[in-house]
């Protein structure tokens, strides 16, 4: 557990008066329909709010929307609907906010049936002004910004055309027809799939994968017989139909599709799917669905090439293609992921890994909780976390697990304590050490958010009744104060705080209901006066991440190195501030066999850390090997785990084996690729 003082809960002095002076109400002058909120830029304080209201008439639906802008983190809003000519905005496209601090915003308007094309409103000054632009096509998807250049936009049309703009939506050019899916890659590259015959659906498995690196001047076909493709980290994945049957396989490229290797993963049939759960520049977590409608599959983790995969977790809960999985990256501590497995009795259990999928375990039972009736043993059970699946099943879970990179070690989640996830009303649990230990934080379901890099946690009870109370904690959830932010309770719809958890402002959204009407209302509370001073050196303490055995010299070593962080003391009530940067001190660990995965042709017998050569590749799928332009596979049986930084220590050596003769040809070999120019 992270360091903290075990003291009685002390009240934050004069907090009611301090918060009352910093609580700002805004009543929106519209009927309650739907509301969407977007932050424009980072640390700008600019929020756009779009409210829409549909009036169903006998022959058509009449829509009305209003646009509001705040530049003080939501304390005040100005109606700027006139800047978009009082046009009805299509909420299904949302507000397309530009990357980084570009200040760019695109809104897609609703247009009448007979029009030649759609209409957008563009702003490049953080929504101070908008320019109306009529499009030469009807958009099917939201405008997508190039991550490298926010002036470059792409969109698909309702007629499956791929349209590109080089001047932030002022002029558009159709660069290709019959396009199913398009994505920006790195360096302003666009990847897209095309169909030749009927449609995207009809040609599934017979699509072509194309690439353009110059916004449509020239193209290269980089794959055929494509079912789908995806980008993750530095990897480009394509799922490709096999020549012989209806199965398909994952191929991977790390050079933008110039060369491909077949991933050492099981093939899947028509009803199955692959899913990239997480990816970074080092490695990939890949889910492979089981045959049949089981609702589970297997997680595999890749090597640094994305080619060789190790089985990471069996019976991983993932309902259907595009369905629900509880897989969660705990962003507050390196290497930590949480997900759910489906046990043989169809109950759901939570598993956690601290070493990027190397080993999975149950979550430790919180000390201040008792096992519920799902437990076979009253004294031995685990914490089970409610995530996407529970939410989809309409269990009483208002929010998924929450962690923030700059709130080191903090994880907040709904859960139940037993042998499996329970249908009983859940409580809220917190971990301050990245998931190693947990404490019950709040009774019953709540909405929660992290402010000031973990200096404040805010929560609101999930209730069907109107609410007027907010709870906050300045000591990582140990002690809670309650503040009544309004005399008149509101029907709560959501908590909003600036992404990144650096802000000290929280907005409470809801609506008031009177006899004749209901209106949107927001309350923005600034906690700056609660944390009245800036944190100093004495407010921080050293914390070793992943520490489980302080006596062990290798304590805290995960993926070849350990990290010491400066953590805010729980007893310190001070501001980390908007410019707070996580201070960490890494130190390299000695290598052990745990720092290596087994290369292709080798495996780890159970409970053994050594990689052993497979007696022969007979009986194994011969397509499980390296393709592309490599002449032979050179391996010593071990490959360092992606991202592992260990040095010295164990240095496993194996003689090089030439396995090329045991491989078959590649579906995506270079001779099948071609180029063309416009």
């Amino acid at each position: 557990s992270a360091p903290g003082e075990d003291e009685e809960c002390g009240r934050v002095r004069d907090f009611v008066a301090k918060l009352a002076n910093n609580t700002h109400q805004h009543v929106f002058d519209d009927l309650r329909g739907s509301v969407s909120l977007s932050w424009v830029g980072d640390s700008t304080g600019v929020i756009l709010v779009l409210t829409t209201f549909h009036v169903p008439l006998v022959i058509m639906t009449f829509g009305q929307s209003k646009l509001y802008r705040s530049e003080d983190y939501g304390k005040n809003f100005k109606d700027i609907t006139d800047l978009i000519n009082n046009t009805f905005i299509r909420t299904e496209f949302g507000m397309a906010i530009g990357p980084e601090n570009s200040g760019k915003v695109v809104l897609t308007a609703e247009v009448s049936g007979g029009s030649r094309g759609g209409r957008i409103f563009r702003s490049s000054d953080f929504a101070k002004n908008f320019v109306q632009t009529d499009l030469p096509f009807h958009p099917l998807t939201q405008m997508m910004y190039s991550p490298q250049n926010s002036d470059y936009l792409l969109a698909l049309s309702t007629e499956n055309g791929l349209w590109v703009s080089k001047n932030f939506g002022g002029k558009w050019e159709e660069i290709h027809k019959a396009v199913c899916l398009a994505k920006w890659g790195s360096d302003n590259t666009i990847f897209f799939t095309t169909y030749a015959n009927g449609s995207c659906k009809a040609d599934l498995g017979a699509l072509e994968l194309w690439r353009t690196s110059d916004l449509g001047k020239s193209f290269k076909t980089i794959g055929v017989k494509i079912y789908s493709f995806g980008l993750g980290g530095r990897f480009l994945f394509a799922s490709v139909m096999a020549d012989k049957d209806t199965t398909r396989r994952i191929h991977v490229s790390t050079d933008q599709g110039d060369t491909w290797s077949m991933a050492q993963l099981p093939s899947v049939g028509q009803e199955q799917f692959y899913s990239i759960l997480a990816a970074n520049d080092d490695m990939v977590f890949m889910h492979v669905d089981e045959p049949g409608d089981t609702g589970f599959g297997t997680i595999f983790t890749s090597d640094d090439r994305g080619i060789v995969y190790s089985k990471s977790l069996d019976r991983h809960l993932y309902t259907t293609t595009g369905g629900e999985t509880d897989f969660t990256n705990v962003t507050s501590l390196r290497g930590v992921y949480i997900t759910s497995v489906l046990s043989e009795d169809n109950s759901i259990q939570t598993m956690i890994t601290f070493d990027q999928g190397g080993r999975w375990t149950h979550l430790r039972k919180p000390e201040n909780s008792e096992c519920d009736a799902t437990a076979k043993n009253k004294n031995e059970c685990s914490l089970h976390i409610h995530a996407s699946y529970s939410i989809s099943q309409k269990l009483n879970v208002p929010m998924a697990p929450l962690s923030e990179p700059n709130a080191v070690g903090i994880v907040i989640a709904h859960g139940s304590v037993g042998d499996a996830i329970s249908v009983m009303v859940p409580d809220v649990y917190i971990s301050d050490d990245g998931g190693y230990s947990w404490t019950k934080m709040l009774e019953g379901p709540h909405y929660y958010t992290i402010l000031d890099s973990g200096g404040i946690i805010v929560a609101i009870e999930h209730s069907s009744r109107p609410i007027n109370v907010i709870k906050f904690s300045t000591d990582e959830g140990q002690c809670w104060q309650t503040y009544t932010f309004t005399r008149d309770p509101i029907y709560f719809t959501g908590l909003a705080s600036e992404p990144g958890a650096r802000s000290m402002n929280i907005s409470i959204w809801g609506f008031t209901e009177s006899f004749l009407t209901s209106q949107w209302v927001s309350y923005t509370i600034d906690f700056k006066d609660i944390l009245e001073r800036n944190c100093e050196e004495k407010d921080y303490t050293i914390w070793l991440a992943h520490s489980t055995d302080p006596e062990d010299y290798e304590d805290g070593c995960i993926l070849g190195y350990k990290e010491q962080f400066l953590r805010l003391r729980k007893s310190s009530v001070c501001q980390n501030g908007r410019d707070y940067v996580v201070t960490k001190q890494p130190s390299i660990c000695l290598c052990s066999l745990e720092d290596f995965l087994c290369d292709f042709g080798y495996y780890r017998p159970e409970n053994d850390s050594k990689c052993v050569e497979q007696p022969e590749l007979k009986g194994h799928d011969l397509e499980f090997c390296l393709y592309g332009r490599e002449e032979h596979l050179t391996t010593n049986g071990y490959r360092k785990i992606p991202g592992d930084k260990c040095q010295g220590g164990v240095n496993p050596v194996r003689e090089v084996k030439d396995l090329k003769k045991k491989c078959t040809s590649n579906f995506l070999s270079p001779e099948k690729q071609n180029s063309k120019s416009n």
Partner: antibody
């Protein structure tokens, strides 16, 4: 045959505690969950909580949290329900009922509820000063 | 918690007639619903589980239907022993909750 036999009627004063027993027979005691349900005079049924006899783990309805304790004795195949800080509104007939499905959420193969298939005869608890 | 509402509160039916009892949930309970019969001075008896499956030993005149939020218990031809109070109960989300009951009386 499968049977649940409960202890006899009780009369208690406000503030006191009552402990009702429920002895199971005719099936493997530790293999099925047990719920407790009460019924005030002239009123409907109210679920109080559930116990897993295998290890003794429990889950209680929020309304009774802190006042109710469910335990079991595997050697005698008996479950107990103790209700403390009694008040007049706790006057009711208390039933134990076998509840095979338990409370675990289920995967996509959808949780199937089998109902409370066997009930005790009920124990009348009267709270009066 | 999920609120279960039964209607009507009282149903007057002649023997041999059909009785239709209704149960509505405040949110979806899927098919995690059971029906019970209770006679004066007796413990409840399970009739239907999983919304539509008859429990062991329950006559075929009892049938259950529905899924989600709307459920029905039908007694196709009332016998004298069927005059009692009927309760529905959900087990989709804890705490388990019962409807207020429907009393089926002789007309």
């Amino acid at each position: 045959q499968v049977q649940l036999v409960q202890s006899g009627a009780e009369v208690k004063k406000p503030g006191a505690s009552v402990k009702v027993s429920c002895k199971a027979s005719g099936y493997t005691f530790t293999s099925q969950y047990m719920s407790w349900v009460r019924q005030a005079p002239g009123q409907g049924l109210e679920w109080m909580g559930i116990i897993n006899p295998y290890g003794g783990s429990t889950s209680y309805a929020q309304k009774f949290q802190g006042r109710v304790t469910m335990t079991r004795d595997t050697s005698t195949s008996t479950v107990y329900m103790e209700l403390s800080s009694l008040r007049s509104e706790d006057t009711a007939v208390y039933y134990c009922a076998r509840d095979p499905s338990g409370i675990a959420a289920a995967g996509p193969a959808s949780r199937y509820y089998y109902g409370m298939d066997v009930w005790g005869q009920g124990t009348t608890v009267t709270v009066s000063s | 918690e999920i609120v279960m509402t039964q209607s009507p509160a009282t149903l007057s039916v002649s023997p041999g007639e059909r009785a239709t009892l209704s149960c509505r949930a405040s949110q979806s309970v899927s098919s995690n619903l059971a029906w019970y019969q209770q006679k004066p001075g007796q413990a409840p008896r399970l009739l239907i589980y999983g919304a539509s499956t008859r429990a062991t030993g329950i006559p075929a005149r009892f049938s259950g239907s529905g899924s989600g939020t709307e459920f029905t218990l039908t007694i196709s031809s009332l016998q004298s022993e069927d005059f009692a109070v009927y309760y529905c109960q959900q087990a989709r989300l804890g705490p388990w909750t019962f409807g207020g009951g429907t009393k089926v009386e002789i007309k």
